[in-house]
Structure formats: C-alpha cells, structure tokens
C-alpha cells in the first residue's frame, strides 16, 4: 500500500548491450516521480535518476566499476510536487528489479567485420574489437579485453553466386578460411560467448562482400 | 588452460636493469591479457603491469611507471619484462599470469587477484644496493 494517488512501478526490465545498462519500467507517470536504487547483494543501496518523469535509467556508471556482481534495483514512486510523501508504512511505494549479472547477461553487440584480405585461395578476416563502456585507468575495455578467452566469434561465408553458407570459429579476432579462385565471397560474423546460458549470441554483423571497398585481394 | 613460465630473474645492483620472459604453451595465447605481479617476503602480491592481447594497451603499477616495461610476441607465445633502474624495494618473486586484462586490472585494485585462472611458477628478482 501507498499514497493514493500514486502507483507502483511495474515490469522493470534490464537492456544491456556491451555494459551500457538501462533499466526500464511502466507506467508513464500521472501526478508522481520516481526515483532508483541500485545495489550490490552485499553493498549499500544508491540512489540515481531523482524525481524523474522518465521510465528509464541508466545505471551504467555504477554495473561497470564491477560486472561480475549481481545487481538489485528498485524504483520508488512519489506524488509529483510532494516527494516526502510516504505511504502508510512510512516508506514510498516502491518495486524490486529482477537480479542482473552484468557479465552473465550483457547483450553483445552486432560485431563489425573490419577488414579482410585474399591471398591466393587464403582469405583473412579480422573482426573488430568492439568498445565497451567498462573503463579502468582511464580507457574503455574491448569486448576482449573483457571477456579474454570466454569470448569466440562465428564467421558464415558463402559465394556470392550461391546460397549455401559456410561458417568457421575462431578463438581470436581473425579467421583464415580457404576459398576457390576466382571466387567473390561474402562474409558476416557472429560474437559467442559458449559458457553462457543466456543471451550467447550477438545478431550478426552486417554482410561484407569481395569485390567492395572494405576489403583487399591480392593475386599471388 | 594456458601453461606459463618465466625466466630472467637474478641478481641486479641498484640502478641496473634485468629482463624477464614468460613463455606460454596450451590454450590460444593471443586470446588473453598477460600480466606480471610480485610478492616481496612478508607482503602481499602486487599488481607490477599489463598487455591487452593485442600488444596495444599497457598498464602499470605507480611504483613502476616510467621504469618498467611490458611487451608481447604473440608468434612467440612470449611476454617480458623489461626492468630499467631497479631499486631495492623491487627485489620479490615475480609471477606471469594471463586472463582477461578485465581480471588482471580488477585483480590490481583488489590486491592477489588470484582469481585470474594461469599462473607461472615464479622468477626470484633481487637487487642490492
């Protein structure tokens, strides 16, 4: 119970991609605000987006500093124009977030094929290392710098003249596949984390093509 | 699992310089972040430097900076390194250890990071004034 004239958040949801973390809830707020809590299991709770008429926060600052914990929100509504009204209780309404473990369930995001290269019937192809918004010293960590061995990529290939793919796995960010001369191929990559349970695989990455701008062939 | 061991380490006057390798064998080298830290008798481990799996980022301790420098040869599966105007407080048991540069970073800031999953043996450095 609470306020009258207020009601609880409801359907809070986590969208995560690459560690940009925003949680989302319903409804669209009449007369009140709300305001968000995030914790740690064991940590104090902290508070973000205050009185706001959104039904969205980013909480991407506060996951980052470590993404292997797992983290709690909560959002508290209050009646607009008077946030130190309390419910019956004496607390503001609010609701709980489902648990969210950064590392376990970040989304990853669409891979970019960066470049690739034919020599002879060789084609190398390297994919992008893509910029989380996780910093340390100062710098943003790539997806690998993250992840390091957890993270492999899939690359489906096939001739531009036919429709059967073929795919190919890579512990790094390059493949070497071997291809039939004379030949234009098309490319598009996948990023895997295998040990997961959820949200393994990113969408895949736009088609790059042989014979476009992006990559290089080389007659030996 | 990686498998790593180091080697270089000796005896260096004050001043002097001394180069440490770690050679790595088992799972794809060039996947992983590779880092040094040290534990001086009585101490702690501590965080000494980093390389992200390419060679394009490295990162140091304070006490290091400017003094110390980390290097690959992913071809090679070989880390160093290089320990320019060593001091007395350097002298420790330096351990090569790969995982995520994530994990070597975190593991820095809360102190063993002995979590990090391949580890060397360790290389004693000592240096006298």
């Known amino acids: 119970s609470g306020t009258t004239n207020t009601v609880a958040a409801y359907n809070l949801t986590w969208k995560s991609t690459n560690f940009k973390t925003i949680l989302e809830w319903e409804p669209k707020p009449v007369n009140q605000v709300y305001t968000v809590q995030i914790s740690t299991k064991s940590g104090d709770w902290k508070s973000k987006c205050f009185y706001t008429t959104d039904t969205e926060c980013d909480l991407t600052d506060e996951i980052v500093k470590d993404v292997k914990q797992t983290y709690l929100a909560r959002v508290f509504s209050y009646p607009a124009g008077n946030v130190e009204s309390t419910g019956s209780a004496g607390e503001p309404l609010y609701e709980n977030s489902p648990e969210f473990t950064p590392y376990l369930e970040t989304n990853l995001g669409q891979p970019t094929i960066q470049s690739f290269e034919q020599v002879g019937t060789k084609v190398n192809v390297t994919v992008e290392d893509e910029r989380t918004l996780v910093r340390r010293n100062n710098t943003f960590l790539s997806l690998r710098d993250v992840f390091g061995k957890d993270l492999i990529y899939t690359l489906y290939y096939w001739k531009s003249s036919s429709s059967g793919k073929k795919t190919a796995k890579t512990n790094t960010n390059e493949f070497l596949i071997d291809v039939d001369k004379g030949e234009n191929y098309c490319f598009s990559v996948q990023a895997v984390i295998p040990s997961r349970t959820v949200n393994r695989k990113s969408t895949d990455s736009p088609v790059e093509c042989m014979g476009q701008e992006k990559g290089e062939f080389r007659e030996i | 699992q990686v498998q790593l061991v180091e080697s270089g380490g000796g005896l260096a006057q004050a001043g002097g310089s001394l180069r440490l390798s770690c050679a790595g064998s088992?799972?794809?080298?060039?996947?992983?972040?590779m880092g040094w830290f040290r534990q001086a008798p009585g101490k702690e481990r501590e965080f000494v430097a980093a390389?992200?799996?390419?060679?394009?980022?490295?990162y140091y301790a304070d006490s290091v900076k400017g003094r110390f420098t980390i290097s690959r040869d992913n071809a090679k599966n070989t880390v160093y390194l290089q320990m320019n105007s060593v001091k007395p407080e350097d002298t420790a048991v330096y351990y090569c250890?790969?995982?995520?540069?994530?994990?070597?970073?975190?593991?820095?800031?809360?102190?063993?990071?002995?979590?990090?999953?391949?580890w060397g043996q360790g290389t004693q450095v000592t240096v006298s004034s």
């Open positions: 088992g799972r794809t080298f060039s996947t992983d972040a």
């Open positions: 250890v790969a995982d995520s540069l994530l994990a070597l970073l975190d593991g820095s800031r809360g102190g063993p990071g002995t979590d990090s999953d391949s």
């Open positions: 390389i992200n799996w390419s060679g394009g980022s490295t």
